[in-house]
Amino acid sequence: FERTRSLQDPCSNCPAGTFCDNNRNQICSPCPPNSFSSAGGQRTCDICRQCKGVFRTRKECSSTSNAECDCTPGFHCLGAGCSMCEQDCKQGQELTKKGCKDCCFGTFNDQKRGICRPWTNCSLDGKSVLVNGTKERDVVCGPSPADLSPGASSVTPPAPAREPGHSPQ
């Protein structure tokens, strides 16, 4: 038999890692292997998440907490709790429906994920371009043209209009 020292609802006595087993006179049964309950008083244990394929295990499941996944090398997490893995691209690229594509002129991406973003328009802040942008790096803005020595000039190309980057379905 199972003894508990509570006069209230017997299920409220069931701690994390157990569930209130209605099939067995509401005793607190331990969660079976590959399942967990993270809070007390639960009527069922949840099935542990399995990190398979492109997912790999970052934290093992236990009787009181779910497994946590991340992505295998060459992929990165997307969504709450790493619900998806998305392919990495190189810096200077973005992921499209057709795969990794170089950033268009006037845009950059300094990460292995995400979309190419327009270079900063230095002139909007009244500044000039100190270091030109590349596919991998944003421009570096410097002092305003008025602060430069006579004859010096700087041209900031306008950011081209472009469609937002795509992610795989």
Epitope: F1, T4, P15, G17, T18, C28, P33, S62, S63
Partner: antibody, heavy 122, light 109 residues
Framework: EVQLVESGGGLVQPGGSLRLSCAAS?????????PCWVRQAPGKGLEWIGC?????????YDANWTKGRFTISRDNSKNTVYLQMNSLRAEDTAVYYC?????????????WGQGTLVTVSS | DIQMTQSPSSLSASVGDRVTITCQAS??????LAWYQQKPGKAPKLLIY???TLASGVPSRFSGSGSGTDFTLTISSLQPEDFATYYC???????????FGTGTKVTVL
Amino acid sequence: EVQLVESGGGLVQPGGSLRLSCAASGFSFSANYYPCWVRQAPGKGLEWIGCIYGGSSDITYDANWTKGRFTISRDNSKNTVYLQMNSLRAEDTAVYYCARSAWYSGWGGDLWGQGTLVTVSS
Amino acid sequence: DIQMTQSPSSLSASVGDRVTITCQASQSISNRLAWYQQKPGKAPKLLIYSASTLASGVPSRFSGSGSGTDFTLTISSLQPEDFATYYCQSTYYGNDGNAFGTGTKVTVL
């Protein structure tokens, strides 16, 4: 080193009481590891006595035959579990094992102590 | 209460033999069954859990199967160190659910 060490066994008269201890080292009892007691009378099979939830709750799971004579308790600060045995009889003579019942091993006993002998005799 | 019945209670076999031990539960316990090996004067050793999963460090000649009420432990090719007593145990917690089987002693033929 991960181990369980029982102590407290010995000779006791019928009707007497005894408290066995089981000290865990190298791991802590938790919701994933329940301490349990199992006994084995001389020349006989294994007999499950009971287990206690490994976390902070005091839920115990006992074999029906214990009829309240045997009580399992735990001191988390000492990482030790106890078996209080009252109204002992000659048929309680056995080697008493402490075991760890592990969620990771399907609640099987994946770690056992060396056992402590309890002899009930006048 | 759950009762566990093992058969046979004893058997004699030779090195290299295939040995099968059965365990029957008095009610369904799904796959919540463990198998142990015990040698004289020693504590039991976990061989198999969840009816068919081999415990760490256990040789692959040991295997388990079954679900519900009927379970089997098989030793594919008996080795000298396998002569021992084997026990099944329900790991279906609560209501006297963790009972051991009656044991099977494997001796040299």
